[in-house]
């Protein structure tokens, strides 16, 4: 995590945002603390986005003033109201689209000063896989599934046995467009699978990286995803 | 405390508009939008449009060519305006303001307007 | 449109009994699913919001659950004061869309 600041003018306060990555259709959250004040009525708190002319969101004098809120964001902004007094200027981003990618500056105003920080903010769409053993196949084949995809990831097996193994030979991976048109579901088979080891199947994309595991032995199945975003940095 | 005050006609004659006023009081239009839901007779609650604090407006597709929603900030108004009407148009119509500034129940309710459009 | 398929139409409950009632969405709505009390020739009343809320003044006896696309509203020991018609509705995507309701009747 790479932690930075945003000052502005002789009497500055510390704005601190974090990178982070929405998953479309969901709500994402756009992070942002300041240097609190004692009193809420002094505190004016402003989201714009680069390339908008209105505003994403404003809230001052304890209320929010969204009369030169940009159409874009219209009824899909919130802050968290009760912890701004605490300088937490986060914002609450309903239905996350692809087109709400981009830089975004929180601009902050106190009793004490000014400040800013830019955020970078990413949209796709990324989810668990989940690797299951696929028995109406002719020999042993293992599925990996993970629902919603954007942009197209790539997938990559590996196996505990046979560490550093190419498995691309003996693996198939389709993506299949979903009924919203902009996400994919990912399908990768692996053939030949050998029981007593630990496979994994590894989707990435430029947002997201998830892992879905499955351990095959003769007695059980166990199986554990995971799932991580890429590039959360703070400035 | 949060008010959302209605007035309007109750009879409309079938094919004239219907024009309600939506007067709210405890907190700001330039804060909140402000929805419309109607409920025919033994039906259930249909959402009509919304005007947000922008000004900007969304509307039910099945209406946006008869219906229009437009405010006056400095007198805490919304107006509420629907043409062509039709015998099936006979409901009580509501204004209503959310919970939050993202759409995410509707907390306040004006106390309805019974609109009978007969001849 | 998203459509929100309320179940059952109506129950007739007594009082002290636990009541479940349950709304269906036609496609994900995530947590934006929010629930009416409605007394007949009154306004609807907001109960729980984002799917598992309870809106301030609502008696604990009621909550809400689920996500996606199934959503439960559940009153823990009914009262006679919650003789009322019950609806769901969903405020994800436009146009929102409501439920058509479960009448809860008291024995």
């Known amino acids: 995590l790479i932690i930075g600041f945003g000052i502005s003018g002789r009497h500055s306060i510390t704005v601190t945002t974090v990178a982070s990555a929405g998953n479309i259709g969901e709500d994402g959250i756009l992070s942002c603390t300041f240097e609190p004040d004692i009193k809420l009525s002094d505190i004016v708190i402003q989201w714009l986005k680069e390339g908008v002319i209105g505003l994403v969101h404003e809230f001052k004098e304890g209320k929010d003033e969204l009369s030169e809120q940009d159409e874009m964001f219209r009824g899909r902004t919130a802050v968290f109201a009760d912890q701004v007094i605490v300088g937490n200027a986060s914002l609450r981003l309903k239905n996350v689209q692809l087109t709400d990618a981009g830089t975004y500056k929180c601009y902050i105003i106190t009793s004490k000063g000014k400040g800013n920080a830019n955020l970078e903010y990413k949209t796709g769409a990324f989810s668990m896989p989940e690797v299951n053993v696929d028995y109406n196949a002719s020999s042993e084949t293992l599925r990996c599934e993970a629902p919603r995809w954007f942009p197209q990831p790539t997938v990559v097996w590996a196996s505990q046995v046979d560490q550093g193994a190419n498995f691309s030979e003996v693996s198939n991976t389709s993506f299949e467009l979903n009924s919203e048109n902009v996400t994919m579901k990912v399908v990768s088979v692996l053939y030949n699978v050998t029981i007593n080891n630990t496979y994994s199947c590894m989707i990435e994309n430029d947002i997201a990286k998830a892992t879905g595991d499955i351990k095959v032995t003769e007695s059980e199945i166990k199986r554990r995803s995971h799932l991580q975003l890429l590039n959360s940095k703070a400035s | 405390q949060v008010q959302l005050q209605q007035s309007g006609p109750g009879l409309v004659q079938p094919s004239q508009s219907l024009s309600i006023t939506c007067t709210v009081s405890g907190f700001s239009l330039t804060s909140y939008g402000i929805h419309w839901v109607r409920q025919s007779p033994g039906k259930g609650l249909e959402w009509l449009g919304v005007i947000w604090s922008s000004g900007s407006t969304d509307y039910n597709a099945a209406f946006i060519s008869r219906l229009s929603i437009s405010k006056d900030n400095s007198k805490s108004q919304v107006f509420f305006k629907m043409n062509s009407l039709q015998s099936d148009d006979t409901a009580i119509h509501y204004c209503?303001?959310?919970?939050?500034?993202?759409?995410?129940?509707?907390?306040?309710w004006g106390q309805g307007t019974l609109v009978t459009v007969s001849a | 449109n998203i459509v929100m398929t309320q179940s059952p139409k109506s129950m007739s409950m007594s009082v002290g009994e636990r009541v479940t009632l349950s709304c269906k969405a036609s496609?994900?709505?995530?947590?934006?699913v929010s629930w009416y009390q409605q007394k007949p020739e009154q306004s609807p009343k907001l109960l729980i919001y984002g799917a598992s809320n309870r809106y301030t003044g609502v008696p604990d006896r009621f909550t809400g659950s689920g996500s996606a696309t199934d959503f439960t509203l559940t009153i823990s020991s009914v009262q006679a004061e919650d003789l009322a018609d019950y609806h769901c509705g969903q405020s994800y995507s436009y146009p929102f869309t409501f439920g058509s309701g479960t009448k809860l009747e008291i024995k």
């Open positions: 209503a303001r959310d919970i939050t500034t993202i759409a995410e129940g509707f907390a306040y």
């Open positions: 496609e994900n709505v995530g947590t934006y």
